[in-house]
């Protein structure tokens, strides 16, 4: 079945942009001017998920790349990674759970909770140029709020 998708960039609440850091990692840093062209463009897709009142299930792929953010256990800890997929089969309505994030949208701020690991969120550090990761706390030192901008 076809899925609704859009292209966007994400910035954290400190206005740090997300860029590639090696082939399978994202990092967050402040960008200005022409450097903004480095930021990753996501293909966000509306997928099937658990019933909920305020959470919308999405998958986050990298535009024009066969890479999706996914959540897996590594050394017994929920971990965010970029995973290669077969572009002929993705995106799809019924994405595997590790690819699904529950988008929580309040006052133009977005949070992305892992469907696989409830209460774990896509997060960035306060520090510059640190990896984007899966964090188990909201409202602490680490940043879990993002803003989204459409990209044409």
């Amino acid at each position: 079945a076809p899925v609704r998708s859009l292209h966007c960039t994400l910035r954290d609440a400190q206005l740090k942009s997300l860029v590639m850091s090696g082939p399978y990692e994202l990092k967050a840093l402040h960008l200005q001017g022409q450097d903004l062209e480095q930021q990753v463009v996501f293909s966000m897709s509306f997928v099937q998920g658990e019933e909920s009142n305020d959470k919308i299930p999405v998958a986050l792929g990298l535009k024009a790349k066969n890479l999706y953010l996914s959540c897996v256990l590594k050394d017994d800890k929920p971990t965010l990674q970029l995973e290669s997929v077969d572009p002929k089969n993705y995106p799809k309505k019924k994405m595997e759970k590790r690819f699904v994030f529950n988008k929580i949208e309040i006052n133009n701020k977005l949070e992305f909770e892992s469907a696989q690991f409830p209460n774990w969120y896509i997060s960035t550090s306060q520090a510059e140029s640190m990896p984007v990761f899966l964090g188990g706390t909201r409202g602490g030192q680490d940043i879990t709020d993002f803003t989204m901008q459409f990209v044409s």
Partner: antibody, heavy 119, light 108 residues
Framework: EVQLVESGGGLVQPGGSLRLSCTAS????????MAWVRQAPGKGLEWVGI???????YYASWAKGRFTISRDTSKNTVYLQMNSLRAEDTAVYYC?????????????WGQGTLVTVSS | IVMTQSPSTLSASVGDRVIITCQAS??????LSWYQQKPGKAPKLLIY???TLASGVPSRFSGSGSGAEFTLTISSLQPDDFATYYC??????????FGQGTKLTVLG
């Protein structure tokens, strides 16, 4: 004040074209999904389509090919281009903002603009 | 996905409890919204995700259901509630569909 204002409606002959505009104030269209919904006189609501970024538009099956939704973020305006109009396209056309991205429901509506297709 | 509301018209009195039903042609989980529309006005979102009350909507309105069967209940009709009500499938792939509407009128 957060609001939507539609314009561009009017009388058009069958086979003609019309472009409707929907201008947003109080918020930016750079991160808001916008839909068009129409209502024929005395009839129910009918979804036309929705736009996210300029390359991501989705339409009701009956609207594909004849209707095109676009946006100009610099003018904070969304458009509905309607071609090959027929009498059955006569309706009030509303633009509406999606409550949250992919929520599919609409929390902010314009006042509507009437399109009449008649010779 | 086709959305079918019943009844098409409903007459009731102030203070009555009113129930409007909406049936989807296939399961839509809880991806259903309800709107109220008054003549010459734009629709107003009442309920989303089948049971969540939209901001500013009085608590006499409630929604329930999941899968393919949904209901909108007005616990005690007020004069301001006489209007047309629409259900809407909000999560059906790339397409969004409204029910045909239920017109709520004053009895007598």
């Amino acid at each position: 004040e957060v609001q939507l204002v539609e314009s561009g409606g009017g009388l058009v002959q069958p086979g003609g074209s019309l472009r409707l505009s929907c201008t947003a104030s109080g918020f930016s269209l750079s991160s808001a999904a916008m839909a068009w919904v129409r209502q024929a006189p005395g009839k129910g609501l009918e979804w036309v389509g929705i736009i996210y970024d300029s390359a991501s538009t989705y339409y009701a099956s009956w609207a594909k090919g004849r209707f095109t939704i676009s946006r100009d973020t610099s003018k904070n305006t969304v458009y509905l281009q309607m071609n090959s109009l027929r009498a059955e396209d006569t309706a009030v056309y509303y633009c509406a903002r999606e409550r949250a991205i992919f929520s599919g429901d609409f929390v902010l509506w314009g006042q509507g603009t009437l399109v009449t297709v008649s010779s | 996905i086709v959305m079918t509301q019943s009844p098409s018209t409903l007459s009731a009195s102030v203070g009555d409890r009113v129930i409007i039903t909406c049936q989807a042609s296939q399961s839509i989980d809880n991806w259903l919204s309800w709107y109220q529309q008054k003549p010459g006005k734009a629709p107003k979102l009442l309920i989303y995700r089948a049971s969540t009350l939209a901001s500013g909507v009085p608590s006499r309105f409630s929604g329930s259901g999941s899968g393919a069967e949904f209901t909108l209940t007005i616990s005690s009709l007020q004069p301001d509630d006489f209007a047309t009500y629409y259900c809407q499938n909000t999560g059906g792939g790339v397409s969004i569909a409204f029910g045909q509407g239920t017109k709520l009128t004053v009895l007598g």
